[in-house]
Interface confidence: low
């Protein structure tokens, strides 16, 4: 409508007792420059006088005189574009409607702006993303519908009452579209932050507390598990029983499935929180863990290394090297699967025990023809003595000896 003055400013401005209010404002008059400006508080039109009644907070006429009691109200505008205002300090009874009565040479206009002044500093508002997942970076936003050049404030983030170490980015807006102070904090929540309290605290320039907003974090995370084993050292002997228990220390949302894994492979038909292994065999040695899933995904416990101890199995002998040339060196290695490892070995040459040879390896530095034959061994650990295996044959090569002509 070309018959109207055009104004742009925030519809409502918010402040509290003792703070200030900065009103960004632009206008375009219908004709010529502004000649008179009056700022009313709660103006009412009087039909009898054809004028507005109400408290005059500020008055500027062609003479440019401003009464001294209006010092807290400042018109920071000009005669054709800017109508920005400042009230410092602002009081509770300033709440209501501000009326900007503008007059040019031939035209008049009343522009209304709402002012909401609270008794105490009002709290900021924390905005969280719709869903927060562990280890995924999110931005926490704290928004306060207030900003004023004459009243510096700060927004501080706290986690469980302790300042958060992450750097927050604070921005302010004092435009004709919006007036606010905003703090944004990038944060990678861990599962242990679930249920914790985050606070955005409004403080004055000296760090004095003014107000706050709090939220409780709802951090979605995979199940967190603890595995317990009986016996606690997870060392058993063949034929013993083992019980493993899986405990869920935290899950959000609730868990849905349970399974057990051995060496990374799922154990069939083991879908409860207790794994009972009866009369274990050595093949059941390995790394066990429990896996519990929820809508976020699977969670795994730490691995328990189950050691099933058993007496040595029948041993085999490895010879380095056979056939051997007379005068060369040879090493024999006794190999036997056992848990714990064998502590003692007995060596045999052609069925006869080799005295003083109790190690896993036997080293002969200089081979003679009589060293040829079958070598076998027996391994021994705390659980018993193994059986003697088939042994290995040492072939000794040597040059002709005591040559006789026939």
């Amino acid at each position: 409508d070309s018959s109207k003055w055009v104004f742009e400013h925030p519809e409502t401005l918010y402040a509290w007792e003792g703070a200030c209010v900065w009103i960004p404002c632009t206008y375009r008059a219908l004709d010529g420059d502004l000649e008179s400006f009056i700022l009313f508080h709660n103006p009412e039109y009087n039909k009898n006088t054809s004028k507005f009644d109400g408290t005059r907070l500020y008055e500027s006429t062609k003479d440019g005189k401003v009464p001294s009691e209006q010092k807290r109200v400042q018109f920071l505008g000009d005669k054709n574009k800017n109508c920005t205002l400042s009230i410092h300090p602002v009081h509770l009874n300033d709440s209501g409607q501000l009326g900007l009565r503008m007059e040019s040479k031939t035209e008049k206009w009343m522009e209304r702006i709402h002012l909401n002044v609270s008794e105490r500093p009002f709290p900021p508002h924390i905005q969280l993303p719709p869903e927060i997942q562990e280890s995924q970076e999110v931005t926490l936003t704290c928004l306060l519908n207030f900003s004023c050049y004459g009243y510096p404030i700060q927004l501080q983030w706290l986690l469980e009452g302790v300042p958060m170490r992450q750097a927050a980015v604070t921005s302010t807006s004092l435009t004709i579209k919006s007036v606010f102070t905003r703090s944004e904090l990038k944060f990678s929540p861990q599962w242990s932050h679930h249920g914790k309290i985050v606070t955005c605290q409004l403080q004055d320039a000296d760090g004095k507390f003014l107000s706050n907003d709090t939220v409780q974090l709802n951090v979605k995370h995979t199940p967190k598990l603890e595995i317990k084993v009986t016996p606690s050292d997870a060392i058993v002997r063949e034929g013993d029983s083992v019980t493993m228990t899986c405990e869920v220390s935290s899950s959000n949302p609730e868990y849905t499935t349970v399974s057990w894994l051995k060496d990374g492979t799922s154990l069939k038909k083991q879908n409860t929180f207790t794994l009972n292994l009866r009369e274990v065999t050595k093949d059941q040695s390995g790394k066990y863990c429990c896996q519990v899933s929820n809508d976020v995904g699977p969670g795994r416990s730490e691995e328990v290394f189950l050691q099933v101890q058993y007496a040595p199995e029948p041993s085999t002998v490895q010879i380095l090297h056979s056939p051997a040339v007379e005068g060369s060196q040879v090493e024999f290695l006794c190999m036997s699967l056992a848990n714990p490892l064998p502590t003692n070995y007995t060596w045999y040459h052609n069925g006869k025990e080799m005295q003083g040879r109790t190690e896993e390896k036997v080293h002969i530095p200089k081979i003679l023809p009589w060293h040829a034959g079958t070598y076998s061994c027996v391994a021994e650990n705390i659980l018993g003595t193994g059986q003697r295996g088939p042994g290995a044959e040492l072939d000794v090569q040597y040059p002709p000896k005591k040559v006789t002509t026939v």
Partner: nanobody, 124 residues
Framework: QVQLVESGGGLVQPGGSLRLSCAAS???????MGWFRQAPGKEREFVAG????????YYADSVKGRFTISGDNAKNTTYLQMNSLKPEDTAVYYC??????????????????WGQGTQVTVSS
Amino acid sequence: QVQLVESGGGLVQPGGSLRLSCAASGSWFNIAMGWFRQAPGKEREFVAGIRWSDSKTYYADSVKGRFTISGDNAKNTTYLQMNSLKPEDTAVYYCAAQRYYRGSYNRQTNYDHWGQGTQVTVSS
């Protein structure tokens, strides 16, 4: 360096009461504090714990209804009010602080800092 200092131990008759205090030096953040005890010739065992975020408390079955753990997170202080004391409560009582969440509050290995201990003797 964080230090935990216990106080309030002493000799008390069966049925009597004692209040133990544990103060953490310096300004640092912990998420939970707990009390453990060790009787002569026995392993150290969990007594009570408190989580600051919601003031949730945890107790060993043997002390439930008799002992109360409380505290002031702002001051990094925890208290153990022990009522209806029995001779079997005789032990050195240790205060512990959990700085990072590690799971169960009744497991010794989940606590980062320990006090030197205060002796509690219940005897007639």
